[in-house]
Amino acid sequence: RTTSFPTVTTTAVPTNTTIKSNPTSTPTVPRTTTCFGDGCQNTASRCKNGGTWDGLKCQCPNLYYGELCEEVVSSIDIGPPETISAQMELTVTVTSVKFTEELKNHSSQEFQEFKQTFTEQMNIVYSGIPEYVGVNITKLRLGSVVVEHDVLLRTKYTPEYKTVLDNATEVVKEKITKVTTQQIMINDICSDMMCFNTTGTQVQNITVTQYDPEEDCRKMA
């Protein structure tokens, strides 16, 4: 059999990151400054850096503080995300369904029924994998029915998330290889929910969501 499996590369992530900036004035005071008296009307039009006047004070956006939101905070604490996701791009060939043009149309009843049964079948296949979230069919094409789909995985963020997801992707490979070897047409009969072509299973790509604190910081800035 020729099942092709690619390798996946990810980079390790620190648990917490503080990005320092170099402000020209005193750091870390409250980000809202109350104004009382006649001069407040003037202040309203002078809120800087995207600050908005709420009738009493400038409401400053993240990263700014001061009476007019003119001061830049010195540092931002960026915690890691709650969860990390991975996406495996797979192709399997379903032999128990004949391809029809209607299957190309994702809004057709044929596609919806196929999707429902394929999803049900894959939920059974991957039922023992805690990180398994679901499948998403991206394309159906001729031959009997070639199913291009994503297997979606998710795990809680821990320093070991990469190992957890690497292990999960290996189990996905094992399970899909096993089911597509076992559930095959015998004498043109499929005695299962779905039957597969043993040699039609391929893993094209594995993507793990990267946690990049510097990028997060840039987005916040």
Epitope: S96, V97, K98, E110, N187, I189, C190, S191, D192, M193
Partner: antibody, heavy 120, light 113 residues
Framework: QVQLQQPGAELVRPGASVKLSCKAS????????MHWVKQRPGQGLEWIGM????????RLNQKFKDKATLTVDKSSSTAYMQLSSPTSEDSAVYYC?????????????WGQGTLVTVSA | DIVMTQSPSSLAMSVGQKVTMSCKSS????????????LAWYQQKPGQSPKLLIY???TRESGVPDRFIGSGSGTDFTLSISSVQAEDLADYFC?????????FGAGTKLELR
């Protein structure tokens, strides 16, 4: 919900062929094989064969290869079975049935059956 | 062709009793690679179409009461009804879904005393 509609009865003269219909609704007609099953009064069930709406391919039990012809009309979601040169042995209830999915081989849905009576 | 043999051909039971009926196949219906037995059971009430009860020898179709229990492996299979109800009066057929031509047993008629 899935429905397979069959006429209740057909009276046919010996030797005159009869064409039985099965109109499907409530599911995607083109991705399921349609099967036909025979049941003689007070007896068991016999699998006749199956046809596929997407390309009209049919597969028959060898026992019925000279008796039954299976066809489909995709536009009306209707499957047909023609019985040639009927004799009293062909008097039976004929069911159309839909498998669990695609090419699966156990039957989740059945028509009400057509009682064929071969009589002069 | 795979021959399916059912026994007994009929049995009479009282409401609440446990019922057991047998189905034997002339060759094994076990797929050794996935350990599934390719056997289905149907119920046919008088004047009605057959209704799927069980497939893969022991998997109940959705909506089928849990008093219906399928068991067995290889060539010997059993359908049990743990506590017979009046509405269970029917013929019961086994069917192999292992190879063409698909074949059925002759049936077991369940009558109520």
């Amino acid at each position: 919900q899935v429905q397979l509609q069959q006429p209740g009865a057909e009276l046919v003269r010996p030797g005159a062929s009869v064409k039985l219909s099965c109109k499907a609704s409530g599911y995607s007609f083109t991705i399921y094989w349609m099967h036909w099953v025979k049941q003689r009064p007070g007896q068991g069930l016999e699998w006749i064969g199956m046809s596929h709406p997407s390309d009209s391919e049919s597969r028959l039990n060898q026992k019925f290869k000279d008796k039954a012809t299976l066809t489909v009309d995709k536009s009306s979601s209707t499957a047909y079975m023609q019985l040639s040169s009927p004799t009293s042995e062909d008097s039976a209830v004929y069911y159309c049935s839909r498998p669990y999915y695609g090419s699966s081989a156990w039957f989740a849905d059945w028509g009400q059956g057509t009682l064929v009576t071969v009589s002069a | 062709d795979i021959v399916m043999t059912q026994s007994p051909s009929s049995l009479a039971m009282s409401v609440g009793q446990k019922v057991t009926m047998s189905c034997k196949s002339s060759q094994s219906l076990l797929n050794s690679s996935n350990q599934k037995n390719y056997l289905a059971w149907y119920q046919q009430k008088p004047g009605q179409s057959p209704k799927l009860l069980i497939y893969f020898a022991s998997t109940r179709e959705s909506g089928v009461p849990d008093r219906f229990i399928g068991s067995g492996s290889g060539t010997d299979f059993t359908l049990s009804i743990s506590s017979v109800q009046a509405e269970d009066l029917a013929d019961y057929f086994c069917q192999q879904h292992y190879s063409f031509p698909l074949t059925f047993g002759a049936g077991t008629k369940l009558e109520l005393r």
